[in-house]
């Protein structure tokens, strides 16, 4: 898939003109009837500059551009307001984040970005990254955070429902690429790559700091509006749900997992860790004494001592005193 | 033109509730956020909330959460303001103005509040 | 929230003389702001929006300027009529705020 520089073949260019002309008359629709085609979770009406539309997000009021995707944090912080043979798979790195805290009501900067630190109503304050996924233990308000961690690297892990068949790899691969060119409006250049083993599919998009250039569409929000579509619940206005067809055959995805991978690795301190260690050693050990205590039982059955012991225990304990 | 329309002034008694009213003419006004302003006597404008007649969406500043609720009337494009638990704090004079730009405000409702 | 301060908090001129009102932001707000004048037991009235946008009906000796922290309002000449609270306010997010207010006083 990779191509060495120079310019675009003469066929990519059309449907480039065609992505700047799509940019183009949305922003006009927007103008016209005053609604955001790129985020339902907006309230639009027409006392924007120069008395234009303009649209904004349900919970910050912040003022949209309904020509591009909508951040991530501003549209969680809506949400929460709004009135719910070679193994080609990738191994997420030891370093990946999956968000298991779930849903929680962001603050976002000045441009709708995630703040570095989060913090919510009980004073619990953690650090985040790009995406918004926390990236360090919780703790108080002391907590520094001195900088936004970019996620360079994000991993989308699907599993399709079964088929008659498996899909045709280079199929499955044009068809999420178009996907995320033109639905989510993701530079085809960030879109690293589309791995297949049936039913899983992998879909690896990158984007480092220094690639992103101005008006590009960044990875976690195309990520973050993907994932949406995927539960059915599109955030574009008045577009029917995702309708994903390789070769005309319907691919229906039931599960879904998304890994995120920061330009710096996660600051998790060793009490997370010894926490999981402990649980495994924890685990052994009860085994192993389980093992032990069925062994005993067996061979105390077979010399028919068991029961004596029992009863001589249960009399001991008889001798407690009551609490 | 456009219009905003609000009474001159309420008198009720610390503890009471009140509901102000705000009636719209002269544009459409299920397009446009109407927003709510506090002014107490000799002191500067404060931002209570607003709410979009066409969806009936809301929003408060924080110090105005369980003090005021705002609604909407569309049939008669009335916008009101209830004020619970009156203090004495609460004696102002109360606007609704239109849009995020504030471009039409109405005269203002003076609100006291005296046993 | 964003604060917005306004400097000074009175300003004294004489009839004819070119007035300037400071706002400053506590965080960057692009061009939403607005300013309003309000005289004595009157309503507000929306003098400039998004800045620098003029309303019609307001004279043209009112001016606004700036984006992100830092605005101005200006009056070129300022006439007795001028005499009023000045305050500025933002658009930008929830909650909405507004300045303190600058009185402008006729020496």
């Known amino acids: 898939m990779a191509r060495g520089p120079g310019l675009a073949p003469p066929p990519l260019r059309l449907p480039l003109l065609l992505l700047v002309l799509a940019a183009v008359t949305g922003h006009t629709a927007a103008q016209d009837n005053c609604t955001c085609p790129t985020n339902k979770m907006t309230v639009c009406s027409p006392d924007g500059p120069g008395g234009r539309c303009q649209c904004r997000a349900l919970g910050s009021g912040m003022a949209v551009d309904c020509s591009t995707l909508t951040s991530k944090c501003l549209l969680l912080k809506a949400r929460m307001s709004a009135p719910k043979n070679a193994r080609t798979l990738v191994r997420p790195s030891e370093h990946a984040l999956v968000d298991n805290d779930g849903l929680y009501d962001p603050d976002c900067d000045p441009e709708g970005r995630f703040k570095a630190r989060q913090c919510n109503q009980t004073s619990v304050c953690w650090c985040v990254n790009s995406v918004g996924v926390r990236r360090t233990d919780k703790g108080d308000l002391s907590l520094r955070c001195d900088e936004l961690v970019r996620t360079h690297h994000i991993l989308i892990d699907l599993r399709h429902r079964p088929t008659a068949g498996a899909f045709n790899h280079s199929d499955l691969d044009a068809e999420l690429r178009r996907l995320f060119r033109e639905r989510y409006r993701l530079h085809p250049k960030f879109v690293a790559a589309v791995h297949y083993e049936q039913p899983t599919i992998q879909i690896e998009l990158r984007q480092n700091t220094s690639q992103k250039a101005a008006g590009d569409v960044d990875i976690g929000d195309a990520a973050y509006y993907f994932e949406r579509d995927i539960k059915g619940e599109s955030l574009f206005q008045g577009r029917g749900g995702l309708d994903l067809r390789v070769r005309g055959e319907p691919l229906q995805v039931e599960r879904t997992l998304i890994y995120y991978l920061d330009e710096i690795p996660p600051k998790f301190s060793m009490k997370r860790l010894t926490a999981g260690l402990i649980a495994v050693i924890v685990v052994v050990v009860v085994a192993l004494v389980a093992g032990m205590a069925v062994l005993v039982i067996t061979n105390r059955r077979k010399s028919g001592k068991y029961k004596k012991v029992e009863i001589k225990e249960l009399g001991e304990l008889r001798k407690e005193p009551s609490l | 033109q456009v219009q905003l329309q609000q009474p001159g002034s309420e008198l009720v008694r610390p503890g009471a509730s009140v509901k102000l009213s705000c009636k719209a003419s002269?544009?459409?006004?299920?397009?446009?956020?109407m927003h709510w302003v506090k002014q107490r006597h000799g002191q500067g404008l404060e931002w209570i909330g607003n709410?979009?007649?066409?969806?009936?969406?809301?929003n408060y500043d924080e110090k105005f959460k369980s003090k005021g609720t705002l609604t909407v009337d569309t049939s008669s494009s009335t916008a009101y303001m209830h004020l619970s638990s009156l203090t004495s704090e609460d004696s102002a004079v109360y606007y609704c103005t239109r849009s995020s730009v504030f471009d039409y405000w109405g005269q203002g409702t003076t609100l006291t509040v005296s046993s | 929230d964003i604060l917005l301060t306004q400097s000074p908090a009175i300003l004294s001129v004489s009839p004819g003389e070119r007035v300037s009102f400071s706002c400053r932001a506590s965080q960057n707000i692009g061009t939403s702001i607005h300013w309003f004048q309000q005289r004595t037991n009157g309503s507000p009235r929306l003098l400039i929006k998004?800045?620098?946008e003029s309303i019609s009906g307001i004279p043209s000796r009112f001016s606004g300027s700036g984006s992100g922290t830092d605005f101005t309002l200006s009056i070129n000449s300022v006439e007795s009529e001028d005499i009023a609270d000045y305050y500025c306010q933002q658009s930008n997010s929830w909650p909405f705020t507004f300045g303190s207010g600058t009185k402008l006083e006729i020496k």
């Open positions: 002269g544009y459409t006004f299920t397009s446009y956020w």
């Open positions: 998004y800045a620098s």
């Open positions: 709410i979009y007649p066409g969806g009936g969406y809301t």
